[in-house]
């Protein structure tokens, strides 16, 4: 399944702790693109290997 990404709705602007929220249109779900040095589904963990 090819997902299309857009900015998340305003309801989810704070969803990603250390990253950018992207909206998976077809799945109706949020996803996070983490800033450098962070990992996790919501970019909530510092990457100790970075």
């Amino acid at each position: 399944v090819v997902s299309h990404f857009n900015d998340c709705p305003d309801s989810h602007t704070q969803f990603c702790f250390h990253g950018t929220c992207r909206f998976l249109v077809q799945e109706d779900k949020p996803a996070c693109v983490c800033h450098s040095g962070y990992v996790g589904a919501r970019c909530e963990h510092a990457d100790l290997l970075a």
Partner: antibody, heavy 116, light 107 residues
Framework: VQLQESGPGLVKPSQSLSLTCTVT?????????WNWIRQFPGNKLEWMGY???????SYNPSLKSRISITRDTSKNQFFLQLNSVTTEDTATYYC??????????WGQGTLVTVSA | DIQMTQTTSSLSASLGDRLTISCRAS??????LNWYQQKPDGTVKLLIY???RLHSGVPSRFSGSGSGTDYSLTISNLEQEDIATYFC?????????FGGGTKLEIK
């Protein structure tokens, strides 16, 4: 996925309204948000709140002091409780599966009348 | 809360017609606009999500468009089974809110 609402069709003013949504074909702990929506006489729709697959809840601020949504994962059911009802709570109540922006699948609805 | 307005509460059309139902939001909802169909028996189905995307199983005669605060649903070749009430819903901001509905009737 199929959703089916059930519960009393008549509730007295000041009492609590309790409804059950039974979900088949999908586990409510797997994903998605499990919502309650109501439709007043005259067609106006109102989102009431949801319980997510993880168990977290979100409620419409207009109802926050009166509403509770819970679940029984062993029965794959979720529940609506609305306290201190008045005749203004007379509506058709729907349960629906949603994501973060839309309601993809709805139950058939159940009419609840609040009357003495 | 974001107010959703469907200015036309009822619409009369003939089978085979092309018709458009409008919906306006009280503020920019960034294309997070969905359309639902409610049949006379109360059954509700999602038709279109994110302004213009067809939900699975929905006939291609349904289409959606719009941006910012103004959105529309178009039925290109009206069929008997399309007789229903149509609701818009914004999904950008909690609490999610609905338009008042547009009831479609046959001339």
């Amino acid at each position: 996925v199929q959703l089916q609402e059930s519960g009393p069709g008549l509730v007295k003013p000041s009492q609590s309204l309790s409804l059950t949504c039974t979900v088949t074909g999908y586990s409510i702990t797997s994903d998605y948000a499990w919502n309650w929506i109501r439709q007043f006489p005259g067609n106006k729709l109102e989102w009431m709140g949801y319980i997510s697959y993880s168990g977290s809840t979100s409620y419409n601020p207009s109802l926050k002091s009166r509403i509770s949504i819970t679940r029984d994962t062993s029965k794959n059911q979720f529940f609506l409780q609305l306290n201190s009802v008045t005749t203004e709570d007379t509506a058709t109540y729907y349960c629906a599966r949603g994501g973060i922006t839309r309601f993809a699948y709805w139950g058939q609805g159940t009419l609840v009348t609040v009357s003495a | 809360d974001i107010q959703m307005t469907q200015t036309t509460s009822s619409l009369s059309a003939s089978l085979g017609d092309r018709l458009t139902i409008s919906c306006r939001a009280s503020q920019d909802i960034r294309n997070y606009l969905n359309w639902y169909q409610q049949k006379p028996d109360g059954t509700v189905k999602l038709l279109i999500y994110y302004t213009s995307r067809l939900h699975s199983g929905v006939p291609s005669r349904f289409s959606g468009s719009g941006s910012g605060t103004d959105y529309s649903l178009t039925i290109s070749n009206l069929e008997q089974e399309d007789i229903a009430t149509y609701f818009c819903q914004q999904g950008n901001t909690l609490p999610w809110t609905f338009g008042g509905g547009t009831k479609l009737e046959i001339k």
